[in-house]
Interface confidence: low
Amino acid sequence: SGVFQLQLQEFINERGVLASGRPCEPGCRTFFRVCLKHFQAVVSPGPCTFGTVSTPVLGTNSFAVRDDSSGGGRNPLQLPFNFTWPGTFSLIIEAWHAPGDDLRPEALPPDALISKIAIQGSLAVGQNWLLDEQTSTLTRLRYSYRVICSDNYYGDNCSRLCKKRNDHFGHYVCQPDGNLSCLPGWTGEYCQQPICLSGCHEQNGYCSKPAECLCRPGWQGRLCNECIPHNGCRHGTCSTPWQCTCDEGWGGLFCDQDLNYCTHHSPCKNGATCSNSGQRSYTCTCRPGYTGVDCELELSECDSNPCRNGGSCKDQEDGYHCLCPPGYYGLHCEHSTLSCADSPCFNGGSCRERNQGANYACECPPNFTGSNCEKKVDRCTSNPCANGGQCLNRGPSRMCRCRPGFTGTYCELHVSDCARNPCAHGGTCHDLENGLMCTCPAGFSGRRCEVRTSIDACASSPCFNRATCYTDLSTDTFVCNCPYGFVGSRCEFPVGLPPSFPW
């Protein structure tokens, strides 16, 4: 869609005559008829396929035509078309004399024609006017013309419709060729896509208007590059949304359970080693010479009866010293120079020869231990009672006297959820703020240690000195069969040659 514009500039008819040569009386009151049509090699009569327009009387004989575009739009003359401009045309301009006020063709005498011009050619759409002048024997017409597109039409043929907009359907103005030119901050084929804030995360962020960065669920921060941890996550972080990966020393679903009582409270005294054993519980491993829940009590190093085989313990400033009975030697009198002939096994222990009689091993009756069955089993030496419980020897067994708030064989349970012993197969119950947790012994799994999983007690290679390991499947324990020259439950002690004694 566009408009063919014709600007009449000057008409010269000095003698004031008609095309027939007859003069106009009193002068030639001149008006114009314009016919615009498709291109014809020879312009011939016929329909004005692109349109027609007529002017009022513009002057008498010779006159300049005023540019009247601002006041009514009669000059330039407008010939609108609503099709693709073909680029070629034919134009007929006729000058007529109007004896009266009626300018209709049928009201004029046939010889009222003053002059007629016809041109044809190519014409591209554009803002520039083409100036032309046509001269006949008696008249001269100066005019210019051009083709421009109607509002919202663009392109070489005025065939591209483009209407600037700034709404949900697009944010653009139109270029001279009809292509869209996005308004600042918008992009895409129809300029509907906003350009997000610089650095806004491609996947986790988006925007609905320019320079904005809105976060998708689970993400936060100015550029939507920070994940949101699980709601209620206290001492934890995330790498993807809704995670709660606990900081060191914290546990539980929301990382709100203090698993590092040792670090946070340093309860163990006198250089003892602290081990976390569940939420808010711990165990102190005392250095030699100390005892107590927190290793706060000093003891004689001989109190732990370190000397075996009847050796006598002597306290020294820097530790202790074992005075071994005849036939024994070593730091703890652990090595024997005796054989079964010397009846080395105390308390009814049975003697078994080893290494063709060069060595022996004692098999102790219940409640006795040591390489010569010399020690009554003190089941409290391993400090088995947790959470500050006091260990008491009771004949062949032991028992733990628990501090208030704890229960269980080893005082390992907090009184509350763990009171009903929910953990099967000897699982250790930990009382948490929002429930309990079972720590299962080897060979068991599941929330309550209810699932039995077979384990190979020999998998950790517990036997030394190339001893053969056997797994007892009924108890999931191991037995080491020692080669000649080694003794001990793990075959860890070599049997040396008898030293020379002074007695």
Partner: antibody, heavy 119, light 108 residues
Framework: QVQLVQSGTEVKKPGASVKVSCKAS????????VTWVRQAPGQGLEWMGW????????DYAQKFQDRITMTTDTSTSTAYMELRSLRSDDTAVYYC????????????WGQGTLVTVSS | DIVMTQSPGTLSLSPGDGATLSCRAS???????LAWYQQKPGQAPRLLIY???NRATGIPDRFTGSGSGTDFTLTISRLEPEDFAVYFC?????????FGQGTKLEIK
């Protein structure tokens, strides 16, 4: 003829601010954007951000986010870029360029403004 | 951020030779958002190619842009003395918009 004319050379002390202007002519300023690019001596081109002369929206490169402000004055068809808390490594030629929104290319460019930061 | 890597860093050729300059993006970008600029000493950059393959107004047809995805190329068919300069590629598919480090085309 479309062109951008920038303000002249500036010498600043560390910690100071600089405001460079860029006057546009030959096109409808408010239907376009202005982008700012800098070039340190002997180095490549570094994009700093853009401003829409249409509605004042801005997009700054993260590196400059805390100390840059871009503005426009549509009555004079002028864009401004202010950089605060200047450091010696801000010494560079600062260019403005018209931003053609539907394809994001920069054409034409201003002649450049040399900013020297030295104590 | 998308990193644009140009190669070679320097190209030494004689007038009349052909030149091929490469630009690689660290991730795929639409060719619509890839431009090439020429910069001569002491001057502002000048737009050569936009949309990966369209010559800007007034740019001679000896300059040709091609490529898609992550690999783009600027080809100069017959070097004229005035073509010796630094060439930069630039992407604006993803904010922040980034330039390559440049290829210096020098006379051998």
């Amino acid at each position: 003829q479309v062109q951008l004319v920038q303000s002249g050379t500036e010498v600043k002390k560390p910690g100071a601010s600089v405001k460079v202007s860029c006057k546009a002519s030959g096109y409808t300023f408010s239907y376009n954007g202005v982008t700012w690019v800098r070039q340190a001596p002997g180095q490549g081109l570094e994009w700093m951000g853009w401003i829409s002369a249409y509605d004042g929206n801005t997009d700054y490169a993260q590196k400059f986010q805390d100390r840059i402000t871009m503005t426009t004055d549509t009555s004079t068809s002028t864009a401004y870029m202010e950089l605060r808390s200047l450091r010696s490594d801000d010494t560079a030629v600062y260019y403005c360029a018209r931003y053609s929104w539907n394809n994001h290319w920069f054409d034409p460019w201003g002649q450049g403004t040399l900013v020297t930061v030295s104590s | 951020d998308i990193v644009m890597t140009q190669s070679p860093g320097t190209l030494s050729l004689s007038p009349g030779d052909g030149a091929t300059l490469s630009c690689r993006a660290s991730q795929s970008v639409s060719g619509s958002y890839l431009a090439w600029y020429q910069q001569k000493p002491g001057q502002a950059p000048r737009l050569l190619i936009y949309g990966a393959s369209n010559r800007a107004t007034g740019i001679p047809d000896r300059f040709t842009g091609s490529g898609s995805g992550t690999d783009f190329t600027l080809t100069i068919s017959r070097l004229e003395p005035e073509d010796f300069a630094v060439y930069f590629c630039q992407q604006s598919a993803f904010s922040p918009w980034t330039f390559g480090q440049g290829t210096k085309l020098e006379i051998k």
